[in-house]
């Protein structure tokens, strides 16, 4: 609530300020126009949460957020005759909303989730300190190509961690990446705190590894390409080459942003094919070849998941030893 | 076969530093979180510091809080304690234990001497 | 933090005997206990986990029981490779602790 009787030239606070959660993460607070405001008031509404965060004035009569709820979220509001910022509002009303109960040593940790090559998502989890060894756990999943909140079904368990994986595939709808994944992990007996996280399509991309199709040899250079991973087109990956030589056993690594098939050299025109060109290889030398991908900033916020590892190749002979 | 190896204990004097190692062997390494336990002379066992398998979640006794910093590399299967302002009562064989399901230690190393002494 | 005492602090025992120690919690634990056996100068080794069960590989002399806040470790017919310190230990929450010790000698 406010406090102190509000000077004259500001407006009477909101009324009937109320919050609920829809889907898993979708906080939402509405609030009916203050009462006995001034006729010739053309209102505004100016909101924030309770750190002074993410300042708005607006004329609707409600505000959302998309946050997981692990922790207790408020919105203040208060209610002007304008959209200027320096206009002292009404006396502000704060409405919050906790986080569901529970001990919050029972509630899972590290909670986070993969999207595997646009394809399906893998979410993993260390229980919490304060829990019973036979803990039977459940995760919740929605994402707004979904009319209702789903259950994951396949609970597996790698090590220390508990997982579940959905499917989860790219639609060709372009907004479709710049919405998130609400996910909630909570117990089947209702005995540990749920946890929330929320993950945005534009990060935690790991795309399959490429395949590589035709290593060959120009002079002493070597031409390397390959199919990249479905569903990402070239643009939006940077790629790593790795090319050992048995004879040296030399070791290098190439880190290729842009690979373009332009050369002669290269079979051209197939559909999502990259190329690189390795220069000074021994043709007469065994060499092996491997490259994995990994998203880039151009398209996606994320660029630290590499793929796993094509299949090597190898081109040249291996020398006898003599 | 799993296993654990310690390396890195030594002679130091007080106010120094060590940094102990620890190298996996047998396991999906990143799955699975790995603690420091310590033993001084003819005492019993004490817990030190665990690191989660992706590093996210460290913990400390409050005995060596602010002195001594886990770590890991997953990708070389290693775990690492850095010990900074060694004092004479940090002397100790110190374990490194890989931790499974729920807190429970089911491979411990042969252990590695840290002597603190001027 | 959970404090653990372990009894007796130590026992001389002959083969052939059925061993009890015991470990008490300053507070309830459920079944967030484990034993661990220390052979001279060897690293300790897991033997009961969650109070109860077994590790593999131990042999079922060995077994545990208790809840809540008093645990029992027993050995059933001693043999002469038993002579060790015992701990046991809570892992209800940080910091784990582990109790004193319990150091068995073979007459």
């Known amino acids: 609530g406010g406090g102190g009787a509000a000077p004259t030239e500001t407006q009477p606070p909101v009324t009937n300020l109320s919050v609920s959660v829809e889907n898993l993460c979708t906080v939402i607070w509405t609030w009916n126009p203050p009462e006995g405001a001034s006729s010739n008031c053309s209102l505004w509404y100016f909101s924030h949460f309770g750190d002074k965060q993410d300042k708005k004035i607006a004329p609707e009569t409600r505000r959302s957020i998309e946050v997981p709820l692990n922790e207790r979220i408020c919105l203040q509001v208060g209610s002007q005759c304008s959209t200027n910022e320096s206009e002292k509002p009404s006396i502000l009303v704060e409405k919050c909303i906790s986080p569901p109960e529970g001990d919050p040593e029972s509630a899972v940790t590290e909670l986070q989730c993969i999207w595997h090559n646009l394809s399906y998502m893998k979410c993993s989890w260390l229980p919490g300190r304060n829990t019973s060894p036979d803990t039977n756990y459940t995760l919740y999943y929605w994402h707004r190509s979904l009319e209702k909140i789903h259950q994951c079904e396949n609970i597996f368990r790698e090590g220390q961690y508990f997982g579940c994986s959905f499917d989860l595939t790219k639609v060709k709808d372009s907004s479709f990446e710049q919405h998130s994944v609400q996910i909630m992990v909570k117990d089947n007996a209702g005995k540990i705190k749920p946890s929330f996280n929320i993950v945005p399509l534009t990060s935690r991309v790991k795309p399959d590894p490429p395949h590589i199709k035709n290593l060959s040899f120009h002079n002493d250079d070597l031409y390397v390409q390959w199919e990249n991973p479905q569903n990402f087109i070239s643009r939006c990956l940077f790629y790593e080459v790795e090319v050992n030589n048995s004879q040296t056993e030399t070791h290098n690594v190439f880190y290729v942003q842009e690979a373009k098939c332009e050369n002669p050299e290269f079979e051209r025109n197939v559909e999502n094919t990259s190329c690189f060109m390795v220069p000074g290889v021994l043709p007469d030398t065994l060499n092996t070849v491997r490259i994995r991908v990994k998203t880039n900033k151009l398209c996606y916020e994320d660029d630290k998941l590499w793929s796993n590892w094509s299949q090597e190749m190898s081109i040249g002979k291996k020398r006898n030893s003599t | 076969e799993v296993q654990v190896l310690e390396s890195g204990g030594g002679l130091v004097q007080p106010g120094g530093s060590l940094r102990l190692s620890c190298a996996a062997s047998?396991?999906?390494?990143?799955?699975?979180?790995m603690t420091w336990v310590r033993q001084a002379p003819g005492k019993g066992l004490e817990w030190v510091s665990t690191i989660s398998g992706r590093g996210y979640s460290i913990y400390y006794a409050d005995s060596v809080k602010g002195r001594f910093t886990i770590s890991r590399d997953n990708s070389k299967n290693t775990v690492y304690l850095q010990m900074n302002s060694l004092r004479a009562e940090d002397t100790a064989v110190y374990y490194c234990?890989?931790?499974?399901?729920?807190?429970?230690?089911?491979?411990w190393g042969r252990g590695t001497l840290v002597t603190v002494s001027s | 933090e959970i404090v653990l005492t372990q009894s007796p602090d130590f026992q001389s025992v002959t083969p052939k005997e059925k061993v009890t120690i015991t470990c008490r919690a300053s507070?309830?634990?459920?079944?967030?206990l484990h034993w661990y056996q220390q052979k001279p100068d060897q690293s300790p080794k897991l033997l009961i986990k969650?109070?109860?069960q077994s590790f593999s590989g131990v042999p079922s002399r060995f077994s545990g029981s208790g809840s809540g806040t008093d645990f029992t470790l027993t050995i059933n017919s001693l043999e002469a490779e038993d002579a060790a310190a015992y701990y046991c230990?809570?892992?209800?929450?940080?910091?784990?602790?582990f109790g004193q010790g319990t150091k068995l000698e073979i007459k």
């Open positions: 507070q309830s634990i459920g079944s967030s």
């Open positions: 047998g396991f999906t390494f990143s799955n699975y979180a």
């Open positions: 230990k809570s892992s209800a929450g940080l910091p784990y602790t």
């Open positions: 969650y109070a109860s």
């Open positions: 234990a890989k931790e499974e399901g729920h807190w429970y230690f089911d491979v």
